[in-house]
């Protein structure tokens, strides 16, 4: 069964820009990836980007760029005003949902401050599985 990982990284030189990296470990066919966040704007979940293997990517503010990093991982770059970034991100959780075949949906979430850039094999902070 594949495991989803999430990594959130702040840019060292630019506090208003950071990126969410996520992927699936193991052998599975990816049919859709959705990256979202919770607690950023309101209590609900905000969709940041959707990446389809064939039809490309779609993103919504504050996501600036979404792309595939490898055949089984994606990256979403977010940009916002510095003051808004500091105040909004404290309670924000980023989630990645991978729809894979034959395993169904796999979700992992991570908040900004639990991400350790030096971690070599991040374990998902939350791994919800819905087959």
């Amino acid at each position: 069964s594949p495991e989803v990982w999430v990594q959130v990284q702040m840019e060292a030189t630019n506090l208003s820009s950071f990126s969410v990296h996520c992927g699936v470990l193991g052998y599975s066919l990816i049919s859709l990836v959705t990256v979202s966040c919770e607690g950023f704007v309101d209590a609900g979940r905000t969709k940041l980007a959707v990446l389809h293997p064939e039809f490309g990517t779609q993103q919504w503010a504050p996501a600036r760029q979404a792309h595939w990093e490898t055949p089984n991982s994606v990256s979403v770059t977010l940009t916002m005003g510095q003051s808004k970034a500091r105040s909004s991100l404290a309670n924000t959780t980023f989630c990645c949902e991978f729809v894979t075949f034959p395993h169904g949906s796999r979700v992992a979430c991570r908040d900004l401050h639990r991400s350790d850039p030096g971690l070599s094999a991040p374990t998902p902070a939350l791994n919800l599985q819905a087959d």
């Epitope: 990982w5 990594q7 990284q9 990126s19 990296h21 992927g23 470990l25 052998y27 599975s28 066919l29 990816i30 293997p53 064939e54 490309g56 990517t57 792309h67 595939w68 990093e69 490898t70 055949p71 089984n72 991982s73 990256s75 850039p117 030096g118 971690l119 070599s120 094999a121 991040p122």
Partner: antibody, heavy 123, light 106 residues
Framework: QVQLVQSGAEVKKPGSSVKVSCKAS????????ISWVRQAPGQGLEWMGG????????NYAQKFQGRVTITADESTSTAYMELSSLRSEDTAVYYC????????????????WGQGTLVTVSS | DIQMTQSPSSLSASVGDRVTITCRAS??????LNWYQQKPGKAPKLLIY???SLQSGVPSRFSGSGSGTDFTLTISSLQPEDFATYYC????????FGGGTKVEIK
């Protein structure tokens, strides 16, 4: 133009480990995955696994799971592949290659490649 | 795992010949297929990516086609420098290479 330069040839004893390095120069290192591919003498190409330096996350081919560890050091733009519990069948040329792709779709390919590192396992 | 089967495993041809190499995937891989050329003692070199896109700097005599499970690499007019081994590679689920096709001088 990105170039990948690998460490030199190694001779190892069965049961030991080998660590091969792959240094990138002339381009962005962190945001591109680096894969490792091996080729036994007179044989075909075999993907072992790869790593995205910016996140430090590695993915491995099932065959090598548990025996190979791929790491990356962003500060030196270097990727490493360590293979443990070596046996004679691991005698091969080991290549690193950059996963290059379109980004907006899932099309990826290997370009460029390192020059290769010959690892000989012999008692 | 996705298995990639190349045929033939070797072939003999003359300069100027039209050469066709096929690659079959064990399941549909859409157009997630690449072709590489390798010469003895050298690293592989990318020729074709995404089934039919010619890599920059590669001569136009090389072309790729196919989607799903069946793919073809064609060399329209074989040149002396084309004698080498050719590999297909799928990039749909992780990566797998075909067994290779050695193109030799007749």
């Amino acid at each position: 133009q990105v170039q990948l330069v690998q460490s030199g040839a190694e001779v190892k004893k069965p049961g030991s480990s080998v660590k091969v390095s792959c240094k990138a120069s002339g381009g962005t290192f962190s945001s591109y995955a680096i894969s490792w591919v091996r080729q036994a003498p007179g044989q075909g190409l075999e993907w072992m696994g790869g790593i995205i330096p910016i996140s430090g996350t590695a993915n491995y081919a099932q065959k090598f799971q548990g025996r190979v560890t791929i790491t990356a050091d962003e500060s030196t733009s270097t990727a490493y592949m360590e293979l443990s519990s070596l046996r004679s069948e691991d005698t091969a040329v080991y290549y690193c290659a950059r996963d290059t792709g379109r980004g907006y779709t899932r099309h990826f390919w290997f370009d460029p490649w390192g020059q290769g590192t010959l690892v000989t396992v012999s008692s | 795992d996705i298995q990639m089967t190349q045929s033939p495993s070797s072939l003999s041809a003359s300069v100027g010949d039209r050469v066709t190499i096929t690659c079959r995937a064990s399941q549909s891989i859409s157009s997630y297929l690449n072709w590489y050329q390798q010469k003895p003692g050298k690293a592989p070199k990318l020729l074709i990516y995404a089934a039919s896109s010619l890599q920059s700097g590669v001569p136009s005599r090389f072309s790729g086609s196919g989607s799903g499970t069946d793919f073809t690499l064609t060399i329209s007019s074989l040149q002396p420098e084309d004698f080498a081994t050719y590999y297909c590679q799928q990039s749909d689920i992780l990566y797998t290479f075909g067994g290779g096709t050695k193109v030799e001088i007749k």
